[in-house]
């Protein structure tokens, strides 16, 4: 995206340049260079310092977002003398025209939707495009298919999740004929914005003493095994006054999910339903379809 | 039930290579993760590698790196570790295990263990 | 000399309670990374005992549990039985290795 960069500098500038594609930060080598280092600090006055590169000539910020506004800065001795630059990297255009309430959420485990609205400042004519690069940087998303209102372009469907990994970088960008308009950019964790599907497969089996119920895991986007998921089963008795307390089970994930509880003849009819969770975040799935079981008469 | 069972125990002299097998039972392999994990006797437990999901593929702890090759058969439900260039120290158990949590680094079940020595 | 750090061994009469540490470094156990603990009984494979730090698997008796905090981890056995004597493995990420590492491993003896 194009931004104002500002060169803040002594009479010999080291010529200090930003690529927000590749999140590069360069200058020109210095020769005999004893010492140098890279660092951004944002409006809130935090200072992020990444790694040098192997060359001591860039360096590359990889977990950072610039809508605020930056500004880097480069310290490099000689062994003649030293050298210091700083580059303002601010989110030019009207204040209020970026995008804004910008979410995302991974569902069905293969599709994503990513949702924002368009700024208060925003003119008529705006129009947003949103830019997707994973954690490796190595190749950048457009959106495919834009959602829309009135024109202008408010969300995105994505259903092809190959080229995201675990951390991934969101930019809007916008473009009016009339003013400049600011971006929008953040750092989203696959696994954070996923919502699960419900178990599926879900089965009741019950003898003269005991219902076992049954279940498979979700599919997800994310690699997870049986241990990452956590269950609730909702184990509810039909007909019951209203107010009486559902009983919730917890269950840790397992290579054969089940649960096995007393339930002796005649029973009366129950239902289960059953979500799913990943164990580290608890954001519960949907129910499952109310599996039922035992007799009106029980 | 879930089970692992490898393959028996091998000689093999040093400059050889050795490849251990490990079938699944009761699961189809391509729903599961398998990674290798080795004890020299009397050590402790050694990683050696297997599938990550952040890169979507095999991956090898560094000092097998080259030496080492990991393989799924997923016709017989069968993965597979093939070490090369054999010396004295890899004289060891080596075990086959499924990855219970990704998130967690946890494995469960393990297979029973190959008893590979090297010998000249 | 591995990177997760465990006492060589430990001791503990019938129906005692016993802890095992596991100190690591910013790179694993401080990353954060979860932290999954192993029983070893003589001449048989590993068992997973605890998982996500304080979780247990199904089958492992309450008497085994987990926690974690900073870049240190442990395991405390309550209620200690004979057949508890085995050797136990704590296990993280790394990722300065970028690999999954175990602790040296510690002997426990029931006296």
């Known amino acids: 995206e194009k931004s104002d960069l500002r060169t803040v500098a002594p009479a010999s500038s080291l010529n200090v340049r930003f690529d927000s594609r590749t999140m590069n930060l360069s200058w020109d080598c210095q020769e005999n260079t004893t010492f140098s280092k890279c660092f951004l600090t944002d409006k809130k006055n935090r200072v992020v310092e990444p790694r040098l590169s192997n060359n001591e000539c860039s360096c590359t910020f990889r977990e950072i977002c610039l809508h605020e506004g930056v500004t880097f800065e480069v310290h490099v001795n000689t062994s003649q003398r030293g050298f210091q630059q700083k580059l303002l990297y601010p989110n030019s255009g009207r204040e209020g025209t970026a995008a804004q309430n910008f979410s995302c959420f991974i569902y069905n485990a293969d599709l994503m939707n990513c949702t924002w609205a368009r700024g208060p400042t925003a003119p008529r004519d705006v129009q947003y495009f949103l830019y997707i690069r994973n954690s490796k940087r190595r190749r950048e998303i457009r959106c495919p298919y834009y959602i829309q209102d009135s024109g202008t372009h408010v969300g995105c469907h994505l259903d092809n999740l190959s080229g995201l990994t675990s951390r991934n970088y969101f930019l809007v960008n916008g473009t009016s004929r009339e003013i400049g308009i600011q971006f929008f950019d953040s750092l989203l964790d696959t696994k954070k914005i996923e919502r699960f599907n419900p178990p599926s497969n879900v089965t009741v089996r019950c003898n003269t003493t005991h219902c076992l119920v049954r279940w498979k895991q979700p599919r997800t986007y994310q690699k997870l095994s049986y241990l990452d998921f956590q269950y609730q089963l909702d184990v509810h008795r039909k007909n019951t006054q209203p107010g009486t307390e559902n009983l919730l089970i917890n269950v840790s994930g397992d290579l054969e999910n089940r649960y096995n509880f007393p339930s002796s003849e005649p029973r009366a009819k129950h239902s289960v339903k059953i979500r799913a969770a990943d164990v580290r975040i608890l954001n519960w799935s949907s129910w499952s379809e109310a599996i039922e079981f035992g007799s009106d008469d029980g | 039930q879930v089970q692992l069972v490898q393959s028996g125990a091998e000689v093999k002299k040093p400059g050889a290579s050795v490849k251990v097998s490990c079938k699944v039972s009761?699961?189809?392999?391509?729903?599961?993760?398998i990674h290798w994990v080795r004890q020299a006797p009397g050590k402790g437990l050694e990683w050696m590698g297997g599938f990550d999901p952040e890169e979507n593929e095999i991956v090898y702890a560094q000092r097998f790196q080259g030496r080492v090759t990991m393989t799924e058969d997923t016709s017989t439900d069968t993965a597979y570790m093939e070490l090369s260039s054999l010396r004295s120290e890899d004289t060891a158990v080596y075990y086959c295990?499924?990855?219970?949590?990704?998130?967690?680094?946890?494995?469960?079940?393990w297979g029973q263990g190959t008893m590979v020595t090297v010998s000249s | 000399q591995s990177v997760l750090t465990q006492p060589p061994s430990v001791s503990g009469a019938p129906g005692q309670r016993v802890t095992i540490s596991c100190t690591g470094s910013?790179?694993?156990?401080?990353?954060?990374?979860?932290v999954s603990w192993y029983q070893q009984l003589p001449g048989t494979a590993p068992k997973l005992l605890i998982y996500?730090?304080?979780k247990r698997p199904s089958g492992v008796p309450d008497r085994f549990s987990g926690s974690k905090s900073g870049t240190s981890a442990s395991l405390a056995i309550t209620g200690l039985q004979a057949e508890d004597e085995a050797d136990y493995y704590c296990?993280?990420?790394?990722?300065?290795?970028?690999?999954?590492?175990f602790g040296g491993g510690t002997k426990l003896t029931v006296l």
């Open positions: 296990q993280s990420y790394d990722s300065s290795s970028i690999s999954t590492i």
């Open positions: 295990a499924i990855v219970g949590s990704f998130s967690g680094i946890a494995y469960r079940p």
């Open positions: 009761g699961y189809t392999l391509t729903e599961l993760s």
């Open positions: 910013g790179s694993n156990i401080g990353a954060p990374y979860d």
């Open positions: 996500h730090n304080n």
